[in-house]
Interface confidence: low
């Protein structure tokens, strides 16, 4: 708290310029009026205040709406807005997706905060939907925001939003969002060469059904074992020794690593144990020769 | 072959509006973005907008966005592009062009012959 | 915006020469998400190489790009009559694509 001080004679501010750099804490506190402070909110970006001088300028704009700032301060609050909390972006009505972008791109570059989480949150219930612009808006800067919707929200998610998800945005998407975004993936990258769709659609490929798997191992296309472990055990299921052998390409000696886990080891119990000697990896469990191959459900109820 | 051809030059009075065309063929236009770029009278080009013929989801520039409309309609392989109120400023040459792959994940592989706009009083 | 820079404006070689084209970044274009276009007067654009170093469909071997970051390079090994145009290089990395000014490439 910045005890309240007299300004001093002459010191008073007419505008917000870079003479108040040189300003003490105090000083500030005392000689900028907090009208004129929200008036030309722009200007502060532009002027190289200390970190404490921020904390001034905010604790002034906190006192002039202590129920929350109105959106034309909120647009043009720059870096100020890393001073808040997410309690003091609880109290804003921010409706211009302009505002919203304004502050995302002060955070550019960096993970989603909790007062970013929390000014999306304030944003989209304000519109009372998640329309096309604000979701476009969203994934530009947060493409890992997508695994935050629920399915039901995925579904209106245009293809375009898609095109800048990177892998490790994905991370965190279960297999019922994955089952939406996946093929919305593949309609956006469609049009793109074998290795090159490959490369992008990758990371979708938990939402990914048999028989796009059972194209895609006729491509050359090498998946690495974490993305196989990704993949849907019951689109897995299906799949011949000779078609993972070709899906996998080199890294098929990875199955052996991975023979407890699901979904490889529900697919080892689902092939003939011949067939699997093929592979010459040792892996055990498969259908000995001679037995029919289980109903898919009995089968699931003995592993 | 592959191919996008546009709509003729227009000469158009200011306030006046225009909607020009550009024709897929060759390839299956629901499957690539269209784009439109501009190029001013002896300048560079300046990337407008994005269009996904599927459902007409559209993209604008910056500095495009309110100024031109982009629609489409699948049913006939074309894209649009149209102004309601033409200023004397919108006298440039208009490209369409296809993205090769993906939204702005691609370059733009085949490019329309351009369409000329004269805006003048 | 990522602002591209192309230097020199204007290039003025003989056929059979070689021309090296600067494009510059104002920052990262990533992932090598880089075109290199040429036109001719009267003519539209025409790809000549993507992905900061992939020729496209029907270009001659004399076109190479290279570069990552911020420095990109259009080179022509020799210039044949044809070659002289303006050249753009555009980024598709990061909303909105930009365009360079253009290098124009004219006869010494």
């Known amino acids: 708290e910045v005890e309240k001080t007299a300004c001093p004679s002459g010191k008073k501010a007419r505008e917000i310029d870079e003479s108040l750099i040189f300003y003490k804490k105090w000083e500030l506190e005392a000689c900028v009026d907090a009208a004129l402070l929200a008036t030309q909110m722009d200007r502060v970006n532009a002027i190289p205040f200390t970190y404490e001088q921020l904390d001034v300028l905010k604790h002034k704009l906190d006192e002039l709406y202590p129920q929350g700032y109105p959106e034309s301060v909120i647009q043009h609050l720059g870096y100020l807005f890393l001073k808040m909390s997410p309690e003091d972006i609880r109290k804003w009505n921010v409706t211009s997706l302009e505002t919203l972008k304004a502050l995302l791109e002060v955070n550019k570059g960096h993970e989603m905060s909790p007062q970013v989480a929390t000014l999306i949150d304030r944003f989209v219930k304000g519109r009372g939907q998640l329309d096309k612009d604000t979701l476009d808006t969203l994934t530009a800067f947060y493409p890992g925001y997508l695994c935050s919707l629920s399915p039901e929200e995925l579904s209106s998610v245009p293809p375009s939003s898609i095109w800048a998800v990177r892998p490790q945005d994905l991370d965190t998407c279960d297999p019922r969002q994955l089952d939406v975004l996946y093929p919305k993936a593949r309609l956006a990258f469609q049009n793109m060469n074998g290795s090159e769709y490959f490369v992008k659609i990758q990371s979708f490929l938990g939402g990914a059904p048999t028989e796009d798997l059972k194209a895609l191992s006729q491509q050359n296309v090498s998946m690495d074992l974490a993305t196989f472990m990704k993949l849907r055990t019951d689109a897995v299921l299906p799949l011949t020794v000779a078609e993972v052998q070709k899906l996998l390409g080199p890294h098929v000696e990875g199955l052996k690593a991975e023979e407890r886990h699901r979904p490889v080891r529900d697919w080892i119990l689902r092939q003939r144990q011949d067939d699997l000697d093929t592979l010459g990896l040792g892996l055990q469990g498969g259908i000995p020769n001679g037995y029919l191959v289980l109903d898919l459900s009995m089968q699931e109820a003995l592993s | 072959q592959v191919q996008l051809v546009q709509s003729g030059a227009e000469v158009k009075k200011p306030g006046e509006s225009l909607k020009i065309s550009c024709k897929g063929s060759g390839y299956s236009f629901t499957n690539y973005w269209i784009g439109w770029v501009r190029q001013m009278p002896g300048k560079g080009l300046e990337w407008m907008g994005i269009i996904w013929p599927i459902d007409s989801f559209t993209q604008y520039s910056p500095s495009f966005q309110g100024q031109v409309t982009i629609s489409a309609d699948k049913s006939i392989s074309t894209a649009y592009l149209q102004w309601s109120s033409l200023k004397a400023s919108d006298t440039a040459m208009y490209y369409c062009?296809?993205?090769?792959?993906?939204?702005?994940?691609?370059?733009?592989?085949?490019w329309g012959q351009g369409t000329l706009v004269t805006v003048s009083s | 915006d990522i602002v591209l820079t192309q230097s020199p404006a204007t290039l003025s070689l003989s056929p059979g020469e070689r021309a090296t084209l600067s494009c510059r970044a104002s920052q990262s274009v990533r992932s090598s998400r880089l075109a290199w276009y040429q036109q001719k007067p009267g003519q539209a654009p025409r790809l000549l190489i993507y992905g900061a170093s992939k020729r496209a469909t029907g270009v001659p071997a004399r076109f190479s790009g290279s570069g990552s970051g911020t420095d990109f390079t259009l080179t022509i090994s020799s210039l044949e009559p044809e070659d002289f145009a303006t050249y753009y290089c555009?980024?598709?990395?990061?909303?909105?694509?930009?365009f360079g000014q253009g290098t124009k490439v004219e006869i010494k």
């Open positions: 062009a296809r993205y090769g792959h993906g939204m702005y994940g691609g370059a733009l592989d085949v």
């Open positions: 555009q980024q598709y990395y990061d909303f909105p694509p930009t």
